[in-house]
C-alpha cells in the first residue's frame, strides 16, 4: 500500500509535470507567437484511455515528436530550451510510470493538435491529483 | 508588476563560493521561470542558468558542474549556488521573472547584484 510520504511524492512529481505541460501550452498559445500557424499542423497522438500512472507511456512516446515541434519556435533567447523542457518531463514521467510492468499504449483512432495533446495531457494531471489530495 | 529582490553578492577569491538568492513578489503566477543572467563590464548580458516551476533547468556551458539553480516555489525565490568560482565569473548578476520559456517584453528584471572574483 502507498504510504503517505510516497503519495506525497508522487503528487509534488504530478504538480511538476503540469506546471511544465501548462509553461509549454502557455509558450504556444503566446498571441505574439508566429509560428503557432505551423505548430499546429503537426498531429500527435493521443491515448485511448489515460486514467492510471502506468498511462503516462503515452505520453513519454510523443515526447520527441513534441520536442521537435517546440523547437520550431527558434527564439534568439531561450530561458529555458525545448530539450530542458522535454528533459525534465521525461525524467518526472520515468518516476511515475515506473519501469517494473512494461505497458503497451493504446492510442485513439483520432490524432490531436498540439493544443488538443498538451491540453489532455494537463486535465490527466489535474485529475490524478485531485484524487491524492 | 513583479518586484525582484536580489541578495548575496559581494567579494571572494577564486576557488571559493557565494549563494545569491532572489525573492519575487507582485503579480506571481504559478507557472513561470525564474533566472539568473549576468553582465561583465564591457560585454552584453548572457544567461547563467534558468529554472522553471516544474523544475526544468538551463545552464551556460562555463558555469555547468559549478553552478546549483534551485527554487522555493511557495516563498517564489530562486538560488544560485556558486562554487568554484573563477575572476572570468566577475560580472553584475541579475535576477530574471519570465511567464515563458522564451524571452519577451513582459520579462522583469531585477537591480543587480555585484559578484567580484579576486585575490
Known amino acids: 500500500a502507498p504510504t503517505s510520504s510516497s503519495t506525497k511524492k508522487t503528487q509534488l512529481q504530478l504538480e511538476h509535470l503540469l506546471l511544465d505541460l501548462q509553461m509549454i501550452l502557455n509558450g504556444i498559445n503566446n498571441y505574439k507567437n508566429p509560428k503557432l500557424t505551423r505548430m499546429l499542423t503537426f498531429k500527435f497522438y493521443m491515448p485511448k484511455k489515460a486514467t492510471e500512472l502506468k498511462h503516462l507511456q503515452c505520453l513519454e512516446e510523443e515526447l520527441k515528436p513534441l520536442e521537435e515541434v517546440l523547437n520550431l519556435a527558434q527564439s534568439k533567447n531561450f530561458h529555458l530550451r525545448p530539450r530542458d523542457l522535454i528533459s525534465n518531463i521525461n525524467v518526472i514521467v520515468l518516476e511515475l510510470k515506473g519501469s517494473e510492468t512494461t505497458f503497451m499504449c493504446e492510442y485513439a483512432d483520432e490524432t490531436a493538435t498540439i493544443v488538443e495533446f498538451l491540453n489532455r495531457w494537463i486535465t490527466f494531471c489535474q485529475s490524478i491529483i485531485s484524487t491524492l489530495t | 508588476e513583479v518586484q525582484l529582490v536580489e541578495s548575496g553578492g559581494g567579494l571572494v577569491q577564486p576557488g571559493g563560493s557565494l549563494r545569491l538568492s532572489c525573492a519575487a513578489s507582485?503579480?506571481?503566477?504559478?507557472?513561470?521561470?525564474m533566472g539568473w543572467y549576468r553582465q561583465a563590464p564591457g560585454k552584453g548580458r548572457e544567461l547563467v542558468a534558468a529554472i522553471s516551476s516544474g523544475g526544468s533547468t538551463n545552464y551556460a556551458d562555463s558555469v555547468k558542474g559549478r553552478f546549483t539553480i534551485s527554487r522555493d516555489n511557495a516563498k517564489n525565490t530562486v538560488y544560485l549556488q556558486m562554487n568554484s568560482l573563477k575572476p572570468e565569473d566577475t560580472a553584475v548578476y541579475y535576477c530574471?521573472?519570465?511567464?515563458?520559456?522564451?524571452?519577451?517584453?513582459?520579462?522583469?528584471w531585477g537591480q543587480g547584484t555585484q559578484v567580484t572574483v579576486s585575490s
Open positions: 530574471m521573472y519570465a511567464s515563458s520559456w522564451y524571452e519577451d517584453e513582459t520579462d522583469y
Open positions: 507582485g503579480s506571481i503566477f504559478s507557472i513561470n521561470v
